[in-house]
């Protein structure tokens, strides 16, 4: 299964970045797994995941950086809580699991560039 | 003459971007000049420019956003003063002027991105 | 960003000359190609002449050698085409323009799409 996202982001100043990862569904899913994956240095980890039913918000784990919605076959991502170590190439992965056949699907990655902010001058 | 720069390169929260252009000299060039343009929008214009003497410090002009130095065959350049808007491809452009013969080489161009940073808050 | 204004075009006899001339902004751009181009009604656009400012090399085709000459007035930022000896072939809208990352110092080798600004153009008509 086909999994598009863009091949570059920037950060905001704030540590947010956000993207749309769009896949080619080829039946009517109704249960959708969405997983963010960073890979830097040969290293892969997970960032976030969320289940969601189809037209239904994306739920990730309270203390997830990552928060989303869902439009059709798009899901809109946003990292927050990024740091100038954080860059690197980060994968979505769609899997529709219900109902059956099982589907699988890997974007090429989205680059994220992070740049830590000046600190702000200490007001006396 | 082949000319090599480095694909990606992210301006500091202050707006300073620095890179390297470096180039396969093919004889002894005792005067080159060094022209930095910018690629956006399929629009190209010239960021800055200077001429230099082997050994010697590159000169840009006082108004110039560019300062840069030379060590050998390469060049060390920095951009300062950029804002997101200046996001976009920059072009090293490198001419050995004298001794004859005359060589021109253009790089591949070095991403430059750059992002606004926030405002601090007001020191009330 | 490069501004271009041709002017000097009109109508000319066969035989006769014109001198076009084209000004430049913030010129001059050193190690680019500055050329003269020109269309002629239901034709492609073509390659007249071109000069590599690195060098001062011209290029001309084959059409125009010998009967045209460009330069350039530094001191004017300007860029000239003396033609001479016009045919009613030469008939066309004359275009000057401004490559500033040749992939060659042969400026008409590689034909026009790189070429990155290009003026309004002026119109030049040959009667025989």
């Known amino acids: 299964m086909h999994v598009a996202q863009p091949a570059v982001v920037l950060a905001s100043s704030r540590g947010i970045a956000s993207f749309v990862c769009e896949y080619a569904s080829p039946g009517k899913a109704t249960e959708v797994r969405v997983t963010v994956l960073r890979q830097a240095d040969s290293q892969v980890t997970e960032v976030c995941a969320a289940t969601y039913m189809m037209g239904n918000e994306l739920t990730f784990l309270d203390d997830s950086i990552c928060t989303g919605t869902s439009s059709g076959n798009q899901v809109n991502l946003t990292i927050q809580g990024l740091r100038a170590m954080d860059t690197g190439l980060y994968i979505c992965k769609v899997e529709l699991m219900y109902p059956p056949p099982y589907y699988l699907g890997i974007g090429n990655g989205t680059q994220i560039y992070v740049i830590d902010p000046e600190p702000c001058p200490d007001s006396d | 003459m082949h000319v090599a720069q480095p694909a990606v390169v992210l301006a500091s929260s202050r707006g300073i971007a620095s890179f390297v252009c470096e180039y396969a000299s093919p004889g002894k060039a005792t005067e080159v000049r060094v022209t930095v343009l910018r690629q956006a929008d399929s629009q190209v214009t010239e960021v800055c420019a200077a001429t230099y003497m082997m050994g010697n410090e590159l000169t840009f002009l006082d108004d110039s956003i560019c300062t840069g130095t030379s060590s050998g065959n390469q060049v060390n350049l920095t951009i300062q003063g950029l804002r997101a808007m200046d996001t976009g491809l920059y072009i090293c452009k490198v001419e050995l002027m004298y001794p004859p013969p005359y060589y021109l080489g253009i790089g591949n161009g070095t991403q430059i991105y750059v992002i606004d940073p926030e405002p601090c808050p007001d020191s009330d | 960003q490069v501004q271009l204004q041709e002017s000097g075009g009109g109508p000319v006899q066969a035989g006769g000359s014109l001198r076009l001339s084209c000004a430049v902004s913030k010129y001059p751009y050193s190690g680019s190609c500055m050329g003269w181009f020109r269309q002629a009604p239901g034709k492609e656009r073509e390659g007249v002449a071109a000069?590599?400012?690195?060098?001062?090399?011209?290029y001309y085709a084959d059409s125009v050698k010998g009967r045209f000459t460009i330069s350039q007035n530094v001191a004017k930022n300007t860029l000239d085409l003396q033609m001479n000896s016009l045919k009613p072939e030469d008939t066309a809208m004359y275009y000057c323009a401004v490559d500033l990352l040749p992939r060659s110092t042969r400026c008409l080798d590689y034909g026009l799409r790189t070429y990155n600004y290009w003026g309004q153009g002026t119109q030049v008509t040959v009667s025989s």
């Open positions: 000069m590599f400012t690195g060098t001062g090399s011209t």
